[in-house]
């Protein structure tokens, strides 16, 4: 039940965090005017990924694309592939959780598979996240350069325009969204993870059992070797126990009702 | 068609009040910033006060900080102007106008109301 | 405060001829994040309210003559009207409206020559 529990949680805040690192790629407030200077501006300039903003006053918004790939800052297009593998990662990453979930019965899914993709996910959405952070704290540096450069002339480092001491950039909203989003996809990650341990079954450590088959006599002795049957070289009948240790054959055959204890 | 209409100006003794309305029609009034204008006998423009749509943001002029107070009622379509310790200087022709354009341009502008400050 | 100072006080011109109004600005107008001048243009004619005739220190308002047109960029701006015509008879005022308090120039009066 702990395992569920810990399996749906971790689900939920993944999916939650996810949605947080959308929200914050598609926001236009990764960067803000600083009002510090000039507090009383009737014009207030806001960037983000994909386009700059200007707010006026009379409440027009006019918002202009960087319609430049090349033009770009190389950081600018670092942060945007670091934010485009966390979403991507992340969405792959819920598509095989929910098929992992073990409240969800699809087929004849084994629990190791599910623990298999439980475990899957969770290490996608731990990627996600950390991609997300890595790309606001990317970001984040970056403004903080620009912030102190006092030239005349600075480039932005956004949209490949030169900028005046007359207008200086801070964090933006996106920038706490995205931090917050990692920080949760990343949990939602390890909770997963955790989840799979206890969704893995625990494997029989066979050491020493013997018992009777129907018209036959098998013996198995301790160690990992292979029981004869008395049926000749058949080499289908031939196992290996060894602490749950497997032969290909094994993998591939069904089990019968002789081949476990 | 917007219209902007002025009232509540007059004869006023210097260090009394008076208070100013503008009643907004033809547009939506509480999506857009409003500003207040004024022109003394001969002279030019002059700026008075700007409040945001939703009255977060209020600005003043240096010469009437403090004394003037501007406020809004959405609901009514109409904004307000307080003016209290009234000098001979604010006399003047008060205009509110809206920054209903690009550019933060003051593009509608009422006729206007008389503010007389005599003893 | 930005002080914006209109040259020349009055001006005098021939019609069909040109008229040139200028505004200086103590401070910068240009706003780095859309690359536009925060200077407006208005002319009031006698016994009228203001009008707005340019906005983005360039851009002229729809419905206004294409005799009227603003440049300039910074500190420095200009108002030409390329061919004044009687009805062009009027103060014309710059504003900043980059940055509060938004303060006017002191206008210039044009006139018939």
């Known amino acids: 039940m702990a395992v569920t529990a810990c399996q749906g949680l971790g689900f939920v805040v993944s999916l939650i965090g996810i949605a947080g690192i959308i929200a914050a790629t598609c926001m236009d407030q990764w960067s803000t005017q600083d009002l510090y200077n000039n507090p009383v501006t009737a014009v207030f300039n806001y960037q983000g990924l994909w386009r700059s903003c200007v707010r006026e006053s009379s409440g027009f918004t006019e918002c202009r694309g960087y319609f430049t790939l090349l033009g770009l800052p190389a950081m600018l297009q670092a942060v945007r592939a670091l934010m485009i593998v966390g979403i991507v990662l992340g969405a792959i990453g819920l598509l095989v959780s929910i098929f992992a979930l073990k409240c969800i019965r699809i087929g004849s899914m084994e629990d190791s598979a599910k623990a298999n993709m439980t475990l899957t996910s969770g290490i996608m959405f731990i990627v996600s996240g950390l991609c997300a952070i890595a790309g606001v704290s990317v970001f984040a540096n970056m403004l903080v350069t620009n912030f102190w450069m006092s030239t005349a002339n600075m480039y932005t480092g956004m949209g490949g325009m030169v900028q005046t001491v007359q207008t200086r950039y801070t964090f933006g909203a996106a920038l706490f969204v995205g931090w917050v989003a990692g920080g949760l996809t990343l949990i939602g990650g390890v909770m997963m993870c955790i989840a799979c341990r206890g969704l893995a079954p625990e494997e029989t450590n066979y050491k020493a059992v013997s018992y009777h088959a129907s018209g036959h006599s098998v013996a198995y002795k301790p160690g990992g070797f292979k029981a004869s049957t008395g049926f000749g070289s058949n080499t289908k009948n031939k196992k290996i126990y060894d602490g749950g240790a497997r032969t290909e054959d094994e993998v591939q055959s069904y089990p019968s009702k002789h081949d476990y204890v | 068609d917007v219209q902007l209409v002025e009232s509540g100006g007059g004869l006023v003794q210097p260090g009394g009040s008076l208070r100013l309305s503008c009643a907004a029609s033809?547009?939506?009034?509480?999506?857009?910033?409003m500003h207040w204008v004024r022109q003394a006998p001969g002279k030019g423009l002059e700026w008075v006060a700007y409040i945001s749509s939703g009255s977060g943001s209020i600005y003043y002029a240096d010469t009437v900080k403090g004394r003037f107070t501007l406020s809004r009622d959405n609901p009514k379509n109409t904004l307000y102007l307080q003016m209290n310790s009234l000098r001979a200087e604010d006399t003047a022709v008060y205009y509110c106008?809206?920054?209903?354009?690009?550019?933060?341009?003051?593009?509608?502008w009422g006729q206007g109301t008389t503010v007389t400050v005599s003893s | 405060d930005v002080v914006l100072t209109q040259s020349p006080d009055s001006l005098a011109v021939s019609l069909g001829e040109r008229a040139t109004i200028n505004c200086k600005s103590s401070?910068?107008?240009?706003?780095?994040?859309?690359?536009?001048?925060?200077l407006t243009w208005y002319q009031q004619k006698p016994g009228q309210t203001p009008k707005l005739l340019i906005y983005?220190?360039?851009t002229r308002k729809s419905g206004v003559p294409d005799r009227f047109s603003g440049s300039g960029s910074g500190t420095d701006f200009t108002l030409t009207i390329s061919s004044l015509q009687a009805e062009d008879v009027a103060v014309y005022y710059c504003q900043n409206v980059y940055s509060y308090p938004l303060t006017f120039g002191g206008g210039t009066k044009v006139e018939i020559k």
């Open positions: 401070q910068s107008l240009f706003n780095v994040g859309n690359q536009k001048n925060y």
């Open positions: 106008a809206t920054s209903y354009y690009y550019g933060n341009a003051l593009e509608y």
């Open positions: 983005w220190a360039s």
């Open positions: 033809g547009f939506t009034f509480s999506s857009f910033g």
